[in-house]
Interface confidence: low
């Protein structure tokens, strides 16, 4: 479009942009303001992403995968801003984008490397498989491959099984740990190095409680201050394990300060909840209440699991009636 004799060629600048799957990002590019601006964004130097000249977009030859996903900051072009607004990035968008900007006096080439990360909130689950107990740290969708570390009583464990499956866009990771017969506390950390995002799961086993029929039991559940931040949204769930599966007794959502109780004999102290103490009471115990009780406090950055084992024994009266 311009006579090349007038061009000053400016060496390529390179920047790295890290985006999150399905979020919008900006690929930056600036130039020294000038008249008759031409902007071409290309991917891997071959696919046309966005073209602008003579004061408007020219998207006739735009690659179909970018349709309705790109735009420039039109009011700022005259100020030297050729940045590209890019909607809903996917892992397939990763790669090198080159922005060529021409004005009446020079051509500038800017390179932007786009890396895309995925980190759907992980979970820590407690499972019984036959006679074995397992803690499983898992993340449904993560990219690139995360760093998973386990600690037992704050000491790193080198054994680290990782079950990995790939889907079109990311990895799905399970890291199981056999904790059969252990009373230790466990911690699992999953780190996405690209997004600089870390999630921690912590599991604590409380001493077993022996109670008589028709008594009540108080089960403690207080978050560890290292992880817990009350101004962050979180959810607390109390559940009971019966024959290998958990049934939810009650849950609390911090965002709405809502408590939902599914078991009439379950009670929560509102005042304690306001002090971030999620201990619960179960009234009028019967023999079928024996089992494992799990308190799960979860947010985007952590899961804290506390497990109690309750043994309910027949009262003397019941025993003598039989």
């Amino acid at each position: 479009i311009f006579p090349l004799a007038f061009f000053i060629y400016v060496p390529m600048n390179e920047q790295i942009v890290i985006g999150r799957l399905d979020e919008d990002i900006i690929l930056p590019s600036s130039f020294e303001r000038g008249s008759e601006v031409v902007i071409h964004w290309k991917y891997q130097d071959s696919y046309k992403v966005h073209s602008y000249y003579k004061g408007s977009d020219h998207l006739e030859s735009q690659d179909p995968r970018y349709a309705n996903r790109t735009s420039l900051f039109y009011n700022e072009i005259q100020n030297g801003n050729a940045s590209l607004f890019f909607r809903r990035v996917s892992l397939l968008d990763e790669g090198i984008y080159t922005c060529y900007v021409g004005t009446a006096i020079q051509v500038i080439t800017n390179k932007v490397v786009l890396k895309v990360g995925v980190f759907l909130t992980p979970v820590m689950k407690y499972e019984k498989r036959n006679t074995n107990s397992f803690l499983i740290c898992s993340v449904l969708s993560v990219y690139p491959r995360p760093i998973i570390t386990w600690k037992m009583d704050n000491t790193p464990i080198s054994e680290n099984n990782m079950e990995e499956t790939g889907s079109l866009d990311s990895f799905s990771i399970n890291s199981p740990l056999n904790i059969t017969g252990s009373n230790s506390s466990y911690e699992c950390t999953i780190e996405n190095s690209l997004l600089k995002q870390t999630w921690t799961g912590r599991w604590t086993m409380k001493d077993g409680l022996h109670k008589m029929q028709s008594e009540h039991v108080s089960l403690s559940c207080q978050p560890v201050n290292d992880y817990f931040s009350p101004n962050q949204d979180f959810k607390v769930t109390w559940s009971r394990m019966k024959s290998g599966t958990f049934s939810v007794l009650a849950y609390y959502l911090s965002s709405s300060q809502n408590t939902i109780i599914n078991e009439s004999r379950f009670s929560w102290n509102k005042e304690l909840i306001n002090q971030s103490d999620f201990s619960m009471n179960l009234m009028d115990l019967n023999l079928s209440d024996s089992g494992e009780y799990l308190c799960n406090i979860s947010s985007d950055e952590y899961t804290l699991l506390t497990i109690h084992t309750v043994h309910v024994e027949p009262s003397q009266e019941t025993a003598s009636h039989n």
Epitope: S46, G95, R145
Partner: antibody, heavy 116, light 107 residues
Framework: QVQLQQSAAELARPGASVKMSCKAS????????MHWVKQRPGQGLEWIGY????????DYSQKFQGKSTLTTDKSSNTAYIQLTSLTSEDSAVYFC?????????WGQGTTLTVSS | DIVMTQSHKFMSTSVGDRVSITCKAS??????VAWYQQKPGQSPKLLLY???TRHTGVPDRFTGSGSGTDYTLTISSVQAEDLALYHC?????????FGGGTKLEIK
């Protein structure tokens, strides 16, 4: 389990072209990029480039641009590298490797000898 | 392109020794460094990625450290089967580049 099976050794004349293959099994082929790496006898590793089988796009090291072409056949889970205008400098072992950023599984390598 | 330099082409060690192999990048690669082990006549095997994370099945005598431009692979107690060529690689930006390799020899 993940396996990358590469084609047999090749002997070629200078100026000729050669196409080597890498058949993947044990995982979803379109999920991971496939990289190609060159190793001359007693030397280090050189990254040639990669191809994304899902989209078919490829990215090459400048040194190998024009020398190599990467392709895939999704129906047979196979990746290919074609090398053209062969010279003795192209004599090497060529590896395919499954990518994320790091290369977690490698083929056994295909030895290319260019000789008149 | 980012240049990865392994300053020692050869390193000699004894079984049971601790050995550290170093790798220097020509620019900051943000811990995006992988280490590979290659035994004679075999293809490379991934040991570590993101500078310090062990790949599945890699013995815990192999550890990695580093940030910015300087990275180290350490074998805490060398075994006879560790005799191999060790490559570092940056997986920060394409073109991905490898170091020249360090050959670990057993005395």
């Amino acid at each position: 389990q993940v396996q990358l099976q590469q084609s047999a050794a090749e002997l070629a004349r200078p100026g000729a072209s050669v196409k080597m293959s890498c058949k993947a099994s044990g995982y979803t082929f379109t999920t991971y990029t496939m990289h190609w790496v060159k190793q001359r006898p007693g030397q280090g590793l050189e990254w040639i480039g990669y191809i994304n089988p899902s989209r078919g796009y490829s990215d090459y090291s400048q040194k190998f641009q024009g020398k190599s072409t990467l392709t895939t056949d999704k129906s047979s889970n196979t990746a290919y590298i074609q090398l053209t205008s062969l010279t003795s400098e192209d004599s090497a072992v060529y590896f395919c490797a499954r990518g994320g950023y790091d290369f977690d599984y490698w083929g056994q390598g295909t030895t290319l000898t260019v000789s008149s | 392109d980012i240049v990865m330099t392994q300053s020692h082409k050869f390193m000699s060690t004894s079984v049971g020794d601790r050995v550290s192999i170093t790798c220097k990048a020509s620019q900051d690669v943000g811990t995006a460094v992988a280490w590979y082990q290659q035994k004679p006549g075999q293809s490379p095997k991934l040991l570590l990625y993101w500078a310090s994370t062990r790949h599945t099945g890699v013995p815990d005598r192999f550890t990695g450290s580093g940030s910015g431009t300087d990275y180290t692979l350490t074998i805490s107690s060398v075994q006879a089967e560790d005799l191999a060529l060790y490559h570092c690689q940056q997986h920060f930006i394409t073109p991905y580049t490898f170091g020249g390799g360090t050959k670990l020899e057993i005395k």
